[in-house]
């Protein structure tokens, strides 16, 4: 009887089972009684990486220069082309289709993690002891300046935006 | 149903080309298949000839050397068989088949 | 070429016996994918050949389950459970996974 089901890699058309062509080859006919499943390779600019039946290879991604994209991984007739963002850019999705500048950390805010070309900027806030006066996307916060391994006192305390200020201690005692 | 119908000379001198025609119903010669001759000589078994695939392509026996040709007809959804410099060797009834299905079979005798 | 070798040449039998018929390959007839492409056919007397098994095993659509056909790489039978007086003619292997196709020379079946 004819089959109602087909082994791994295979497929069910007109009550045959039929093998699917492999990654970076495309479907030019099915099989018959009496032959096999007939595939062709991917042209160099498509592909597929998938065991399929599809009749038509996919296009590689295009990284166009003009969204920031740039070639990561040039793409094979098994594998996409991957994008990455050029410096100073990064990926707006997962599928990196455009880019955005990196985000730069405020006044009080310090760097956590430096971009990638897929993550932008992560930022924290400076906290107690800690200041950042700029806006940049690569600063952390620095500490406040230690006024007593100067010798000198704190005259101005500090905040997450600025450091503390340090003046000589005062000889005059009471 | 998928039907082939053969047609052509019944009668070929020796040193002429045998030339046959096979019509297909019920199913597009370009969609896929390979599209067979087949020939029986008189109380003889079967022999393969060649084929012409969906795509237009050509297979055939080495034993007809040079002498065989299998084309198309798209419009038509036919095709065809020349056998040329035929001898007495080649009188036989010659069928078109997708092989699970074949036309009726058409004589063809070689004699002056 | 893949000759193919079918035993016996005739063969009768009675109605409800069962029979069976071989067809050996001088080669195997399994190809890469591990797929095997063998037909066995009858052709009927004053008619074309029928399908009747494609791929070793598979009946063609109408086929009584008497018929029934197996075997492997070079060696492939096909039986018939209980032969009924509509199965006389000869019987025909067929490869078709290499290059030139070719048949068995045949089997007549004849009823007692």
């Known amino acids: 009887e004819p089959p109602t089901a087909c082994r791994e890699k295979q497929y069910l058309i007109n009550s045959q089972c039929c093998s699917l062509c492999q990654p970076g080859q495309k479907l030019v006919s099915d099989c018959t009684e009496f032959t096999e499943t007939e595939c062709l390779p991917c042209s160099e600019s498509e592909f597929l990486d998938t065991w399929n039946r599809e009749t038509r290879c996919h296009q590689h991604k295009y990284c166009d220069p003009n969204l920031g994209l740039q070639v990561q991984q040039k793409g094979t007739s098994e594998t996409d082309t991957i994008c990455t963002c050029e410096e100073g850019l990064h990926c707006t999705s997962e599928s990196c289709e455009s880019c955005v500048p990196h985000r730069s950390c405020l006044p009080g805010f310090g760097v956590k993690q430096i971009a990638t070309g897929v993550s932008d900027t992560i930022c924290e806030p400076c906290p107690v002891g800690f200041f950042s006066n700029v806006s940049s996307a690569f600063e952390k916060c620095r500490p406040w300046t230690s006024c007593e391994t100067k010798d000198l006192v704190v005259q101005q305390a500090g905040t997450n935006k600025t450091d503390v200020v340090c003046g000589p201690q005062d000889r005059q005692r009471a | 149903e998928v039907q082939l119908q053969e047609s052509g000379p019944g009668l070929v001198k020796p040193s002429e080309t045998l030339s046959l025609t096979c019509t297909v119903s019920g199913y597009s010669i370009t969609s896929n298949y390979y599209w067979n001759w087949i020939r029986q000589p008189p109380g003889k078994g079967l022999e393969w000839m060649g084929y012409i695939r969906y795509d237009g392509s050509n297979n055939y026996n080495p034993s007809l050397k040079n002498r065989i040709t299998i084309s198309r007809d798209t419009s038509k959804n036919q095709f065809s068989l020349k056998l040329s410099s035929v001898t007495a060797a080649d009188t036989a009834v010659y069928y078109c088949?997708?092989?699970?299905?074949w036309g009726q079979g058409t004589t063809v005798t070689v004699s002056s | 070429d893949a000759v193919m070798t079918q035993t016996p040449l005739s063969l009768s039998v009675t109605p409800g016996q069962p029979a069976s018929i071989s067809c050996r390959s001088s080669q195997s007839l399994e190809n890469t994918n591990g797929n095997t492409f063998l037909n066995w056919y009858l052709q009927k007397p004053g008619q074309s050949p029928q399908l009747l098994i494609y791929r070793v095993s598979n009946r063609f659509s109408g086929v009584p389950d008497r018929f029934s056909g197996s075997g492997s790489g070079t060696d492939f039978t096909l039986k018939i459970s209980r032969v009924e007086a509509e199965d006389v003619g000869v019987y025909y292997c067929?490869?078709?996974?290499?290059?030139?196709?070719?048949f068995g020379q045949g089997t007549k079946l004849e009823i007692k």
């Open positions: 067929l490869q078709v996974t290499h290059v030139p196709f070719t």
């Open positions: 088949a997708r092989l699970d299905y």
